[in-house]
């Protein structure tokens, strides 16, 4: 259930050189510095556990400060193949190749990896985000153009002695950051090949990876302030539930979202919030320092445990699901956006969830671990929590079986 198995070499302890190697903020993604090519070209790369391509800007774009210049790399190899990635909104397309890649604040290794050189995009790069590419850390099944394109992490593990595991600590600031503050701020840590004990408190609890495509997990119960939403647990995972560092919000299937909002509204009814707030359209503000965190409920997601009929729960605070935003027009107040939204592609446990926890992507053992993050934002009365075990029966029934078709799965 918890992290009690014997220590394994290279998998535990301290990874000082990798701590604090992420920057950014939940609204625009967390990025790590990487180098590509020979001589090395430095780029900031979005860490995305919801996709599987390593793709970088490779042509001028109004939102990019720099981009990968293949012609300047003596080690670039053209795969003479294009790649096109459409999303529900937006897309990117480019040319496939390989080159030497390393992570300066990561393991001291260089690997030859597949790179999609993005030559054209729409609604992909974000103005002011400070990243120029994306590191898809999920599995080959969802790689584009097909699962034969080996993802970066697979190449890393295959070509080096780095254990098949990484962990993420995303640190929400708890207050809005301007551009210069983001550049100076610590955004968190990506520990490649191990677990750093300094980044969490308490125990790590593991949930099985249901299927190796996205990092798919199974939610078996949802509570708002301890009150069960009382829905058929299949609804929570319709049509899947994934852990995705590249998504800002906690996204919930339509029925679940509606039930959750109804329950959060009821719990916070001492104030009347506009309908637009629950839609993510309107901000709510309070005089600086007076945000009434206590009127908002905690949200608990129960995840399938590693042992039959056993589950554990992760609990987030309003400090995670109310995202601080800066607006010059209301700068004298503390303003927030509701960071839970509706999804038509299942539950997405985005930065809103991940900022509460240290999350271990233990690919070697096909499981994801959660522990309370040492950097999560909380107050003197409540803290995020990871607790268990709980007895939960028939958890396998909570998984939704997606009908197999030939259609693309990656329509995010």
């Amino acid at each position: 259930e918890t992290d009690e198995e014997p220590e394994e070499p290279g998998r535990r302890g301290s990874f000082v050189e990798m701590v604090d190697n992420l920057r950014g903020k939940s609204g625009q993604g967390y990025y790590v510095e990487m180098t590509v090519g020979s001589p090395p070209q430095t780029l900031n790369i979005l860490v995305d556990t919801g996709s599987s391509n390593f793709a970088v800007g490779a042509a001028p774009h109004p939102f990019l400060h720099r981009y990968y210049q293949r012609q300047l790399s003596s080690t670039y190899r053209d795969l003479r193949k294009g790649v096109y990635v459409p999303y529900t909104q937006g897309k990117w397309e480019g040319e496939l190749g390989t080159d030497l890649v390393s992570i300066p604040h990561g393991p001291n290794v260089t690997v030859r990896a597949n790179i999609a050189a993005i030559t054209e995009s729409d609604k992909f790069f974000i103005n002011g985000s400070n990243w120029e590419g994306i590191l898809g850390l999920a599995y080959a099944e969802i790689a584009r153009p097909d699962d034969s394109l080996e993802p970066f992490f697979d190449s890393l593990v295959k070509q080096t002695h780095v254990p098949n595991l990484f962990s993420l600590q995303l640190c929400g600031a708890g207050f809005p950051l301007n551009q210069s503050e983001v550049l100076a701020s610590v955004g968190g840590s990506m520990i490649i090949g191990g677990i750093d004990h300094s980044l969490y408190t308490g125990s790590l609890w593991y949930t099985p990876i249901r299927r190796e495509w996205y990092y798919e997990v199974i939610i078996v119960r949802v509570e708002i302030n301890g009150q069960d939403l009382k829905m058929d647990c299949k609804e929570y995972n319709y049509d899947k539930s994934i852990v995705d560092s590249g998504t800002t919000n906690l996204r919930l299937p339509k029925k679940v979202f509606e039930a959750a909002v109804k329950s959060i509204k009821a719990a916070s009814s001492t104030e009347k919030f506009p309908d637009g707030f629950w839609l993510g359209e309107q901000l709510v503000c309070w005089q600086a320092g007076t945000t009434p965190w206590n009127i908002f409920p905690v949200i608990s997601l129960y995840l399938m445990g590693e042992v039959t009929n056993q589950s554990f729960r992760i609990t987030i605070l309003p400090q995670q699901y109310l995202r601080p935003v800066e607006d010059v027009a209301t700068s004298q107040d503390d303003c927030y956006k509701f960071a839970i939204s509706q999804s038509s592609t299942g539950t997405v446990m985005g930065a809103v969830i991940m900022e509460g926890f240290y999350v271990v992507f233990d690919r070697a053992r096909k499981r994801i671990g959660f522990a309370v993050s040492a950097c999560h934002v909380h107050d003197e009365f409540r803290t995020a929590a990871v607790e268990g075990p709980f007895v939960t029966l028939d958890m396998e029934d909570c998984g939704y079986n997606i009908p197999q078709t030939d259609e693309s799965t990656l329509m995010t």
Epitope: Q28, N127, D275, G276, E281, D327
Partner: antibody
Framework: EVQLQQSGAELVRPGTSVKLSCKAS?????SYWIHWVKQRPGQGLEW???????????KYNQKFKDKATLTVDTSSSTTYMHLSSLTSEDSAVYYC?????????WGQRTLVTVSA | DILMTQSQKFMSTSVGDRVSVTCKAS??????VAWYQQISGQSPKPLIY???HRYSGVPDRFTGSGSGTDFTLTISNVQSEDLVEFFC?????????FGGGTKLEIK
């Protein structure tokens, strides 16, 4: 500095259509919804609808759902409003506005005149 | 739809006076009301949000109050540049609606 730059005045024939634009700058375009508001002399302000630039989700005032269509082009940080089957009732000043708390930022106005 | 009623189309005042513009909602809108000022031929300028919070840069002679259905914009020490039109707006529920406006005039 947040700015919403609207397209220029339009003189159009009845029965035709027109597309107004609103170019945003000074903030992360996909982080805030854009609204459109109509103002006719002596008729006050009317909310037409809104669009979320991050995913093009739209919500309309029922009164305008068959009249207005909102779209967005994130590459140019521009929102568009297409008005169809124009009549003299559509002659008005149109504003785009950015969300936040209520509408803290407004475009400078676009005058549409429908005349034969 | 929520009807926002500004019963006085015009109000007479003098420079230096204190004047209160009122707005009534047809149903409870909490404190989700904004006030705008509009000079003829220009865009509305935001003054107040959440019934009583001033937007950045708005002079403190503008004060908002009220909750539920009754709202007031008070201008103390009226200046000549304040002799324009004022609109209230509810942003509690869709469709967002505005009051018909109140114009301040010189006595």
């Amino acid at each position: 500095e947040v700015q919403l730059q609207q397209s220029g005045a339009e003189l159009v024939r009845p029965g035709t259509s027109v597309k107004l634009s609103c170019k945003a700058s000074g903030y992360t375009f996909t982080s805030y919804w854009i609204h459109w508001v109509k103002q006719r002399p002596g008729q006050g302000l009317e909310w037409i609808g809104m669009i979320d630039p991050s995913d093009s989700y739209t919500k309309y005032n029922q009164k305008f759902k068959d009249k207005a269509t909102l779209t967005v082009d994130t590459s140019s940080s521009t929102t568009y409003m297409h008005l169809s089957s124009l009549t003299s009732e559509d002659s008005a000043v149109y504003y785009c506005a950015r969300s936040g708390v209520a509408f803290p930022y407004w475009g400078q106005r676009t005058l549409v005149t429908v005349s034969a | 739809d929520i009807l926002m009623t500004q019963s006085q189309k015009f109000m007479s005042t003098s420079v230096g006076d204190r004047v209160s513009v009122t707005c009534k909602a047809s149903q409870n809108v909490g404190r989700n009301v904004a006030w705008y000022q509009q000079i003829s031929g220009q865009s509305p300028k935001p003054l107040i949000y959440s019934a009583s919070h001033r937007y950045s840069g708005v002079p403190d002679r503008f004060t908002g109050s009220g909750s539920g259905t009754d709202f007031t914009l008070t201008i103390s020490n009226v200046q000549s540049e304040d002799l324009v039109e004022f609109f209230c707006q509810q942003y509690n529920s869709y469709p967002y609606t505005f009051g018909g406006g109140t114009k301040l005039e010189i006595k």
